[in-house]
């Protein structure tokens, strides 16, 4: 976060930024950045493993819900969306593409399918589904 | 738009950041960043009067929509929220608070109640309410 | 069991356009679930990942190469090729195709045995 | 992109010791850590996925561990068929890179 004073090394112009106000990123140009988490809503209909390369692509991954209060911009999505959650059958558990496991209490996890990855839907739902459906996707990239 | 490089002059540290990269804003701490305006949602209903006072005390305004493309995020809202658009009973119009007339196109204006004030809905629809009914609302601030 | 065969001239002058194609056999190459890829190691070196395809087309390249690369799918004959233009003897190696099995974040489970390609006039 | 060290570079073993290969990626890449076995003349088999995921038909011999940065791959008590060159590779984000790799030999 870059507050109070900011020196644009291009232009060597001194900005002046309220102590109260920040600079959030960096992002990939036109993402949404909240609490120094970039995310991009893709309207496009792909299946869970291209959802997944396409976000790769764009030097991210798959949404992944880590806090209710850090992402509390996700109570307010409309619709689902492909998250980066997928369900590992050896051991009955639900981890994210970085192989962490879904923290209990996160996610309220809906079977609205068979399947093993899935939906996000607003108010921190998990809809499970084939991962071969298409549907819209959410990637994310995490900002050190 | 911050990109390249920057000194953060606290520090005095050069960091790189990659030219398609960029930083977001300044908002107000923990407000949403996209397209550098900045945008908060408000969990707590109050009347429209209350929420634009709301706002303004954050050196912002209710929401204004004014492009599809540079606020297609609010597409994906879910639920009704105040945004600053009234209606002018002496000429029939709908301004937003700055007093800038609703460009045709950009909302479908829905009769939900008799009502001179409008609820923003996802897809670009905005509901007609009285404005002493009480809901959540967006406040928006636009970076220069 | 699925296996991949890899084929194409063994010998490309410089400056020229190197082309091979991966036969997949004893699987379906329009799975969902899977991701084709190329890999190269150099003579006596390690491994060098070149990019992959899925069956849809999409492509995924490695930014070093990716000027001189393009990887294609043929579903109808169960093949994807590489193509690797105005090479130089630097991409002399042995080139692999490789399958993911479960996304493209899954490891290489399945190889093709590898074709040498030496780059020389 | 990331970049992916193994240690040692090589290793002279004694069969039935226990080796143990490290490999350290410069960025976290939680578990997306893959290792393989190359054996002259022959293309890759993969050993390990995800960091510590067995594979069906591997010796129970091959195990690894880690997440993050950094990983092992352990040879429980070594075999004569077991000299190869063993690489990791991360899967993370693109372009996927492997290590160096590590050459292991028989005493």
């Known amino acids: 976060i870059w507050s109070a004073v900011f020196l644009n090394s291009l232009f060597n112009q001194e900005v002046q930024i309220p102590l109260t106000e920040s600079y959030c990123g960096p992002c990939p140009k036109n993402w949404i950045c909240y609490k120094n988490n970039c995310y991009q809503f893709f309207d496009e209909s792909k299946n869970w493993y291209e959802s997944q390369a396409s976000c790769m692509s764009q030097n991210a991954s798959l949404l992944k819900v880590y806090s209710k209060e850090d992402q509390d911009l996700l109570k307010l999505v409309k619709s689902y969306h492909w998250m980066g959650l997928v369900h590992i059958p050896t051991n009955g558990s639900w981890q994210w593409e970085d192989g962490s496991i879904l923290s209990p209490n996160l996610l309220t996890i809906i079977e609205m399918q068979k399947g093993d990855c899935a939906l996000y839907a607003s108010s921190f739902k998990g809809y499970i589904e084939n991962c071969s459906t298409p549907n819209t996707y959410i990637c994310m990239q995490r900002t050190v | 738009i911050w990109s390249a490089v920057f000194l953060n002059s606290l520090f005095n540290q050069e960091v790189q950041i990659p030219l398609t990269e960029s930083y977001c804003g300044p908002c107000p701490k923990n407000w949403i960043c996209y397209k550098n305006n900045c945008y908060q949602f408000f969990d707590e209903s109050k009347n429209w009067y209350e929420s634009q006072a709301s706002c303004m005390s954050q050196n912002a305004s209710l929401l204004k929509v004014y492009s599809k493309e540079d606020q297609d995020l609010l597409k994906l809202v879910k639920s009704y929220h105040w945004m600053g658009l009234v209606h002018i009973p002496t000429n029939g119009s709908w301004q937003w608070e700055d007093g800038s007339i609703l460009s045709p196109n950009l909302l479908t204006i829905i009769e939900m109640q008799k009502g001179d004030c409008a609820l923003y809905a996802s897809s670009f629809k905005g509901y007609i309410e009285n404005c002493s009914t009480p809901n959540t609302y967006i406040c928006m601030q636009r970076t220069v | 069991q699925v296996q991949l065969l890899e084929s194409g001239p063994g010998l490309v002058k410089p400056a020229e356009t190197l082309s091979l194609t991966c036969t997949v056999s004893g699987g379906s190459i329009t799975s969902t679930s899977y991701f084709w890829d190329w890999i190269r190691q150099p003579p006596g070196k390690g491994l060098e990942w070149i990019g992959s395809i899925y069956h849809s087309g999409s492509t995924y390249y490695d930014s070093s190469l990716k000027t001189r690369v393009t990887i294609s799918v043929d579903t109808s004959k169960y093949q994807f090729s590489l193509r690797l233009s105005s090479v130089t003897a630097a991409d002399t190696a042995v080139y692999y195709c490789?399958?993911?099995?479960?996304?493209?974040?899954?490891?290489?489970?399945?190889w093709g045995q590898g074709t040498l390609v030496t780059v020389s006039s | 992109e990331i970049v992916m060290t193994q240690s040692p570079d090589f290793q002279s073993v004694t069969p039935k010791e226990k080796v143990t290969i490290t490999c350290r990626a410069s960025?976290?890449?939680?578990?997306?850590l893959h290792w393989y076995q190359q054996k002259p003349d022959q293309s890759p088999k993969l050993l390990i996925k995800y960091a510590s995921q067995s594979i069906s038909g591997v010796p129970s011999r091959f195990s690894g561990s880690g997440f993050g940065t950094d990983f092992t791959l352990t040879i429980n008590s070594l075999e004569a068929e077991d000299a190869a060159a063993y690489y990791c590779h991360q899967s993370n984000s693109f372009p996927f890179t492997f290590g160096p790799g590590t050459k292991v030999e028989i005493k």
């Open positions: 960025q976290s890449i939680g578990n997306n």
């Open positions: 490789a399958r993911h099995e479960f996304g493209i974040r899954d490891a290489f489970d399945i």
